[in-house]
Structure formats: structure tokens, C-alpha cells
């Protein structure tokens, strides 16, 4: 069973560092949860090194990760969502170094998808909609989203909204006239889970109206 | 001050069903697992299960799986433990403890409900 | 599943008097916590994760143990630690060890 490394025990396996970090995504495939852990170094050897996680599942004591080229990952049914878990990684019976993680602390949300952008001419706007496959999920529900979006020539200079919905409205004054933009989306848990940023959705591309001479507004694409 | 409030003592038929109740107070009840615990002769202390008040979840020492059930009514800060068909090896104090989840030791405990199966 | 045996089962001692009781595990465990329980009462959280004391618990209280084998320690018997002490494993099916009645002389 896992436990805390004691001083002395390790011999040479102590004198690297071990340190890691793991994400969870819950209901990521129907009802079974993941959770993901990676070494933070690299150049870590990881041959012979295992994962394990004990505490806070249901009917097991324990559960061992499967290795996937340099990461480690699990697909249970078995996780409580509640307290914190002790994550170990191990030679053997030996653990090398644990931590103690509360997995709705780690929730990493699936990125977005269906990202579209449709302009209305009478509004003088653009209608930003994308989906998430957490409307449908029992637990990790309420998302905060982050909608990025740049112009193309500008690579570094995004502007970022922040929203609990999965439309947004631009105004079409705040854009530059035809223009070429990019625009993408990300989420993060907002209640009760806790967690990171998901990836970004796949980005979208859309072209903003010439300005029309005499009225001073954009022409429609 | 944290509270775990049990219903009274029970004396049941053999066969029949009977549910206890634990009512929570002074914390996030949603915050803790709710465990249920069985002593016997005024000794032994057997673990019989938990629930995630959040979620519902539950996990059950397989010793107890049929014989108990355990639920939780998050309105009222309430978790149940039903147990079914009774036999006097059930005859028994029935305890709810709350679970530290940071530790995984049992560090509120209600006063215990005595359940007697008699005919 | 693990199995935590206590030992010994009953024991008995002078106020003052250094205590020791062991609870011995089946296979190796991380975490070790203990309870007291005095008659007609509930257990009390006590000892958690090894060492650390709960709330409320007296000084003279000490834990330790790795690996099969855990301790709780009273320094100086006093009267109000007589009382029956059982350890815990941490992890499921969270299992009890049988209890040690301690008594005063």
C-alpha cells in the first residue's frame, strides 16, 4: 500500500527528482472518470516507475495506472469525489514520492467544440456560439468559459471574455473593418470543482464588413 | 458546534425493514462523507459503508451490501441508513460518523442508535 | 482485507504508570488512527494519521508505527484514560482492530 517515502529507504532513487502533477476529467467517457498524471521533468527515466493511487474510491483500496508513453492515466468508475487521495510513485513496493490530491480539486473540463461566429447585419454584431459536452454531465456542470479572440496580423494581442453561457455577442464597432479574426474557447470548472483551464477549442476564422463609405458602417461579407 | 443528531432506539420484528437517521448541523454537509458504523456486544466496531452527500455516492463494506442502504436528503442535512430484512445478528448500536476527507478518520460521531430485533 | 489485531486484549494500570498499546496489521498499511471509547458513549476521534492528536486530547497521548506495526502511548496513566482504545485503518473498508480494554489498578 502506498505510503510516505521514509528517510534513508531509497538509496540512489532519491536523489532525483520524482515530482509530478495529474489532472481528473469526470464522466469523460459515459460514466467512467480519468485521471492523467506526468512527470514535471522530462528527462525523467520512468522504466520500472508505476503510479498509484489509494484512498478515496469506492470498494477498492487501491487502484494502479496504465502507462501511455510518458504519462500515466487511469479510466475508472471507482472515484468518491470526495477527500483527498494518496498518490504515490513506486519501484516496486518502494514509493519514491506521494501526494495527497483531492480529485475535484484537478478537473480539467473537455475543450469546447462547434465554435461559429455568424454576423447580423441589422444588429451590427456577431453572434459567437460553441457547445460543451458538460450541459450534459451529472456532475462537473457549471463552466466558466474563456472566448479569446485577435485579429490574424496581431499575433500576441488577444482579447479575452470571460462568461458563463455558450454565446456571446461582439459588436461589430469594436472590430477593425475587414479584418480577418481568429477566435477560440476554453473552460475551467466554477462551482464546487475546482480544477485548470480545458484546451482550446479548435479556432475559428471570421472576416469583418468593409466600413461603407457613407454611413460610416461596415458592408456585410 | 458540529452535530450529528441520530433518531431513537428501535426494537423490530425479525424480517422486517427499518431506517435510521442522521441529521447534520454546524458544518457544509456536503463536505463530508457520512459513514455508518455497527458495534456489537458493546464492543466490536464494524465500518458498513459511506455516502458523498454531494453526489450520492456511495461505498459499501461488502459484508453489509444488501443488508444496508444508505441515502442522504441534502435540503435537510439528513443522511438515512436503511436496513433491511433484519435477523437478530442485527441487533446492534448503529453510529454516523462524519469522515475527514483529508485524513480518512472518523472525527464526528453521533450518539449511536440502538436497534434490537426481537419477535 | 486487512486485519488489525490489538493487544493486549485487557490491561491494567497504576496512575502514573507509562502505557503501550499495539495494533498489529495483516499486511503493511500507511496510516494508522485511533479512537477511545468509555461505557455508553460514542467513540472519540483520538489519535489520526500515526501521531497527530485530536482535538482535545491530553499531551501525555503519543502514536507512532510504520509499515504491520502501531503504537499508542500514555506517558502517565490518569485516572479519566481508562477506557477501551481501538485502531483504525485508514482506508477502505476502514476496519477496526478488536480494542483494548485499559484499567486502572
Known amino acids: 500500500e502506498s505510503g510516505y517515502a521514509q528517510n534513508g529507504d531509497l538509496e540512489d532513487a532519491e536523489l532525483d527528482d520524482y515530482s509530478f502533477s495529474c489532472y481528473s476529467q469526470l464522466e469523460v467517457n459515459g460514466s467512467q472518470h480519468s485521471l492523467t498524471c506526468a512527470f514535471e521533468d522530462p528527462d525523467v527515466n520512468t522504466t520500472n516507475l508505476e503510479f498509484e493511487i489509494c484512498g478515496a474510491l469506492v470498494e477498492v483500496k487501491c487502484l494502479n495506472f496504465r502507462k501511455l508513453q510518458e504519462i500515466y492515466f487511469i479510466e475508472t468508475k471507482k472515484f468518491l469525489l470526495i477527500g483527498k487521495s494518496n498518490i504515490c510513485v513506486k519501484v516496486g513496493e518502494k514509493s519514491l514520492t506521494c501526494k495527497k490530491i483531492d480529485l475535484t480539486t484537478i478537473v480539467k473540463p473537455e475543450a469546447p467544440f462547434d465554435l461559429s461566429v455568424i454576423y447580423r447585419e441589422g444588429a451590427n454584431d456577431f453572434v459567437v456560439t460553441f457547445n460543451t459536452s458538460h450541459l450534459q454531465k451529472k456532475y462537473v456542470k457549471v463552466l466558466m468559459h474563456d472566448v479569446a479572440y485577435r485579429q490574424e496580423k496581431d499575433e500576441n494581442k488577444w482579447t479575452h471574455v470571460n462568461l458563463s453561457s455558450t454565446k456571446l455577442t461582439l459588436l461589430q464597432r469594436k472590430l477593425q473593418p475587414a479584418a480577418m479574426y481568429e477566435i477560440k474557447v476554453r473552460s475551467i470548472p466554477d462551482h464546487y470543482f475546482k480544477g485548470f483551464w480545458s484546451e482550446w477549442s479548435p479556432s475559428y476564422y471570421f472576416r469583418t464588413p468593409e466600413i461603407n463609405n457613407s454611413s460610416g458602417e461596415m458592408d456585410p461579407i | 458546534e458540529v452535530q450529528l443528531q441520530q433518531s431513537g432506539p428501535e426494537l423490530v420484528k425479525p424480517g422486517a425493514s427499518m431506517k435510521i437517521s442522521c441529521k447534520a448541523s454546524?458544518?457544509?454537509?456536503?463536505?463530508?462523507?457520512m459513514n455508518w458504523v455497527k458495534q456489537s456486544h458493546g464492543k466490536n466496531l464494524e465500518w458498513i459503508g459511506l455516502?458523498?452527500?454531494?453526489?450520492?455516492?456511495?461505498s459499501y463494506n461488502q459484508n453489509f451490501k444488501g443488508k444496508a442502504t444508505l441515502t442522504v436528503d441534502k435540503s435537510s442535512s439528513t443522511a438515512y441508513m436503511e436496513l433491511l430484512n433484519l435477523t437478530s445478528e442485527d441487533s446492534a448500536v448503529y453510529y454516523c460518523?462524519?469522515?475527514?476527507?483529508?485524513?480518512?478518520?472518523?472525527?464526528?460521531w453521533g450518539a449511536g442508535t440502538t436497534v434490537t430485533v426481537s419477535s | 482485507e486487512i486485519i488489525l489485531t490489538q493487544s493486549p486484549a485487557i490491561t491494567a494500570a497504576s496512575l502514573g504508570q507509562k502505557v503501550t498499546i499495539t495494533c498489529s496489521a495483516s499486511?503493511?498499511?500507511?496510516?494508522m488512527h485511533w479512537y477511545q471509547q468509555k461505557s455508553g458513549t460514542s467513540p472519540k476521534p483520538w489519535i489520526y494519521?500515526?501521531?497527530k492528536l485530536a482535538s482535545g486530547v491530553p499531551a501525555r497521548f503519543s502514536g507512532s508505527g510504520s509499515g504491520t506495526s502501531y503504537s499508542l502511548t500514555i506517558s502517565s496513566m490518569e485516572a479519566e484514560d481508562a477506557a477501551i482504545y481501538y485502531c483504525?485503518?485508514?482506508?477502505?473498508?476502514?476496519?477496526f482492530g478488536g480494542g483494548t480494554k485499559l484499567e486502572i489498578k
Open positions: 454546524g458544518y457544509s454537509f456536503t463536505g463530508y462523507t
Open positions: 460518523a462524519r469522515g475527514d476527507g483529508n485524513y480518512w478518520y472518523f472525527d464526528v
Open positions: 455516502i458523498n452527500p454531494y453526489s450520492g455516492i456511495t
Open positions: 499486511s503493511s498499511v500507511s496510516y
Open positions: 494519521e500515526i501521531s
Open positions: 483504525q485503518y485508514w482506508n477502505y473498508p476502514y476496519t
